[in-house]
């Protein structure tokens, strides 16, 4: 007998062909011999089965000897062996209906787990294989679990259910609620204005929640809240802001914070957390601030950086248009009795300049 796989909620067409291409008597019955539909004269008649309101046939194809049965809005319990009786012969078609659904909301926070559950008819032994938008393959039986969702898992998941060498494909849209970046670093000279941006990796029609930027300054013994805010339909309103530093926040998305000036005492790292309405858990983005200061005091020219820098970063002091340079993989460099001229302080990573500050050394007579 022929096996046909269907998807819960979908429409399936079970075909039945007569040898002669002409209109003739036919009946569709279920395994209990209960009539579902058939032809009487030129009219489609329906039997007392549970399917009667969802079953139909293509009348236009009857005179071609095609007596298919169409079942709409498939249910798992529609899984059965259906018998088409035409021209004194019986054709059996086994219909297996499967459903694949996410156990929770399909909008999930980064780090949360996704469970896909397969609904299948009794006696079936299907296998499921899912492919994430990022190309990750996951296999399972009745359930498929993704323990920790990542940003790249956002998008359409394609899942293939296999049974008796037949397959049916499901597409499930998953939205991973996360910031675009897990971490970002801003490099600034002392006194410069600092802009922090926290773009989201998703879009929602209504975005409501609340958040906080929690800051650990390198020089401070403990961390503290720099700003708290509410988000109502993508409109940002500040709840509380610390007096030092006095941050400013943009009223629209993406979340945007401005620090009037970069100072060594602000250098450090922060964590912006955002809680969304009707979601347990929070979105996080780490942000780092590195501040540079170049100073001349008496006979000493010093360049310092504060904040989270990796040990492989190089700090250099170099006299413009001259070869005189001092470099260190450290957070401070200095030159005693520097030559007069324009000195450059550079913070670089493998030759790429991340931050520079110029200081003019005037000749001492």
């Amino acid at each position: 007998k022929k096996v046909v796989l269907g998807k819960k909620g979908d429409t399936v067409e079970l075909t039945c062909n007569a040898s002669q291409k002409k209109n003739t008597q036919f009946h569709w019955k279920n395994s209990n011999q209960i009539k579902i539909l058939g032809i009487q004269g030129l009219f489609l008649t329906k039997g007392p089965s549970k399917l009667s309101d969802r079953a139909d046939s293509r009348k236009s194809l009857w005179d071609q000897g095609c007596f298919s049965m169409i079942i709409k809005n498939l249910k798992i319990e529609d899984s059965d062996t259906y018998i088409c009786e035409v021209e004194n012969k019986k054709e059996e078609v086994e219909l297996l209906v499967f459903g694949l659904t996410a156990n929770s909301d399909t909008h999930l926070l980064e780090g949360q787990s996704l469970t896909l559950t397969l609904e299948s008819p009794p006696g079936s032994s299907p296998s499921v294989k899912c492919r994430s938008p990022g190309g990750k393959n996951i296999q399972g039986g009745r359930t498929i679990s993704v323990p920790q969702l990542e940003r790249q898992d956002s998008g359409t998941w394609t899942c293939t259910v296999s049974q008796d060498q037949k397959t049916v494909e499901f597409k499930i849209d998953i939205v991973v609620l996360a910031f675009q970046k897990a971490s970002s670093t801003v490099y600034k000279k002392e006194g410069e204005q600092v802009e922090f941006s926290f773009p989201l990796a998703f879009t929602l029609e209504k975005l409501t929640g609340s958040g906080e930027l929690w800051w650990q300054a390198e020089r401070a013994s403990s961390s503290k809240s720099w700003i708290t805010f509410d988000l109502k339909n993508k409109e940002v309103s500040v709840k509380r802001v610390t007096q030092d530093p006095k941050l400013q926040m943009g009223k629209k998305l993406p979340l945007h914070l401005t620090l009037p000036q970069a100072l060594p005492q602000y250098a450090g790292s922060g964590n912006l957390t955002l809680a969304l309405e009707a979601k347990t858990g929070k979105l996080h983005q780490e942000v780092n601030l590195v501040v540079m200061r170049a100073t001349q005091f008496q006979e000493n020219l010093t360049c310092e950086v504060w904040g989270p820098t990796s040990p492989k970063l190089t700090l250099s002091l170099k006299l413009e248009n001259k070869g005189a340079t001092v470099s260190k993989q450290a957070k401070a460099v200095w030159v005693l009795n520097p030559e007069a001229g324009m000195w450059q302080c550079l913070l670089s990573d493998s030759g790429q300049v991340l931050l520079e500050s110029n200081i003019k050394v005037v000749p001492t007579w």
Epitope: T208, G209, S210, E212, W214, A220, S221, S222, K224, S225, T228, D230, K239, R240, T242, Q243, D244, T273, A275, E277, T280, G281, K282
Partner: antibody, heavy 119, light 107 residues
Framework: EVQLVESGGGLVQPGGSLRLSCAAS????????MSWVRQAPGKGLEWVAN????????YYVDSVKGRLTISRDNAKNSLYLQMNSLRAEDTAVYFC????????????WGQGALVTVSS | DIQMTQSPSSVSASVGDRVSITCRAS??????LAWYQQKPGKAPKILIY???SLQSGVPSRFSGSGSGTDFTLTISSLQPEDFATYYC?????????FGQGTKVEIK
Amino acid sequence: EVQLVESGGGLVQPGGSLRLSCAASGFTFSSYWMSWVRQAPGKGLEWVANINEDGNEKYYVDSVKGRLTISRDNAKNSLYLQMNSLRAEDTAVYFCAREGGQWLSLDYWGQGALVTVSS
Amino acid sequence: DIQMTQSPSSVSASVGDRVSITCRASQGISSWLAWYQQKPGKAPKILIYGASSLQSGVPSRFSGSGSGTDFTLTISSLQPEDFATYYCQQANSFPWTFGQGTKVEIK
């Protein structure tokens, strides 16, 4: 180590006055909002008032407005609660607490000072 | 003012039990909710902030969930030191308000 120590509690007659103090140590006092929370004998917690870092923003629960005043002296690392026109229903243990936790939570609390208003 | 209603007002449980306490706000407070534990004669101690984040140093058997108006504090496996009174508190708008408390007693 963060420490908050209340003092100034005691027995006072209805209509009388009392001033509670809270001495803070182990953190930069001038960088934090501070709160007073009270608890009547055998009852739950009731937030009373709070004050911002420099002392020019203050909020109160309706039942104490005009009678209780919160203030601070950052030079002395001290928080105060001036209590006037006291009533029997003001009888409670008064806790000072730091609003230094994430999401505006009260992360450190003093051991409390008992204020009894009775004739 | 925002009213915070806790339920139940008391619960009798045994060591190892799973205990859940709910807190309902009279209006939406987003995630501006904290949970505190208080033992007799002691000051309250913070357990959960921002509705669902565990305070550093608090055992992982404590968890918080919810947002908007309905919140839950769950103790997954009650320990002898967890017998205390628990309070929720909103920090969405002044005046800050606490729930009336839930006493967790030994059965």
